[in-house]
């Protein structure tokens, strides 16, 4: 069976993991979304998508 991570679906350095129901993107700090496409904007943040100090990595997001 083809590797669902072969197409590199996770953006911004997110790590891809094959899963029985599809795949999972574990987002790098400062990103969120199914494919880590959204920069996290904490309240008061500037337009820069950099992660503020202490922001933990995003929870893995399902991508089905």
């Amino acid at each position: 069976r083809a590797d669902p991570c072969a197409a590199r679906p996770c953006a911004h350095g997110g790590r891809c993991y094959a899963h029985f129901s599809g795949l999972v993107c574990a987002c790098a700090p400062g990103y969120m979304g199914a494919r880590c496409e959204f920069p996290v904007h904490p309240d008061g943040a500037s337009a820069l998508p950099a992660a503020p100090p202490g922001l933990r990595p995003g929870d893995p997001q399902r991508y089905l």
């Epitope: 979304g33 199914a34 494919r35 496409e37 996290v40 904490p42 309240d43 399902r62």
Partner: antibody, heavy 121, light 107 residues
Framework: EVQLVQSGAEVKKPGASVKVSCKAS????????IHWVRQAPGQGLEWMGI????????SYAQKFLGRVTMTRDTSTSTVYMELRSLRSEDTAVYYC??????????????WGQGTTVTVSS | DIVMTQSPSFLSASVGDRVTITCRAS??????LAWYQQKPGKAPKLLIY???TLQSGVPSRFSGSGSGTEFTLTISSLQPEDFATYYC?????????FGGGTKVEIK
């Protein structure tokens, strides 16, 4: 029944703030992202941002950065969108919408009824 | 930002007509595209996601196709309840963006 119910219409003066609520029911609140989309009179749809109700993380469209805040209350399954420093061009219908299956890939499958915000002096 | 261009912006058709609406993306978005229907005074309704997958409960006369930069929404036989405005939306990258809309009116 899966639904999103929004707060009522608001009339605000320029410079003021507005806070719109969106109460979810009929599904597990923390499993699905919530988007906010607005529509000015006679105009198209404009994406404002997204909130992950599970962790409270947010991502806002660039044009709203610094002026919008999206929050959630998991105890009441409610999401809030506050827009500050209102101007006349913020007059619009504001919608909350659910991102399908905890992601945004599937589009926005459930929408609130909309909240009309009128900004006028 | 990815710009979504819909055409036509206005379409006059009769009941029973086959209607096609086109949406073009300013850069490739794979199949990350959704179509919505909106009637006056109402919230949009999701019709199609992933470019070609019909949302549950949507009549089979609606279909979507395309990948990359060019997409189409087709209504095989227009019904009275289909007169509305249709929007495409790209879900490929931040920020999410919509097309300008296509208003389908009765001829």
């Amino acid at each position: 029944e899966v639904q999103l119910v929004q707060s009522g219409a608001e009339v605000k003066k320029p410079g003021a703030s507005v806070k719109v609520s969106c109460k979810a029911s009929g599904y597990t609140f923390t499993t699905y992202y919530i988007h906010w989309v607005r529509q000015a009179p006679g105009q198209g749809l404009e994406w404002m941002g997204i909130i992950d109700p599970s962790g409270g993380r947010t991502s806002y469209a660039q044009k709203f950065l610094g002026r919008v805040t999206m929050t959630r209350d998991t105890s009441t399954s409610t999401v809030y969108m506050e827009l500050r420093s209102l101007r006349s061009e913020d007059t619009a219908v504001y919608y909350c919408a659910r991102g399908g299956d905890g992601t945004w890939y599937y589009g926005m499958d459930v929408w609130g009824q909309g909240t009309t915000v009128t900004v006028s002096s | 930002d990815i710009v979504m261009t819909q055409s036509p912006s206005f379409l006059s058709a009769s009941v029973g007509d086959r209607v096609t609406i086109t949406c073009r993306a300013s850069q490739g978005i794979s199949n990350y595209l959704a179509w919505y229907q909106q009637k006056p005074g109402k919230a949009p309704k999701l019709l199609i996601y992933a470019a070609s997958t019909l949302q549950s409960g949507v009549p089979s006369r609606f279909s979507g196709s395309g990948s990359g930069t060019e997409f189409t929404l087709t209504i095989s036989s227009l019904q009275p309840e289909d007169f509305a405005t249709y929007y495409c939306q790209q879900l490929n990258s931040y920020p999410l963006t919509f097309g300008g809309g296509t208003k389908v009116e009765i001829k």
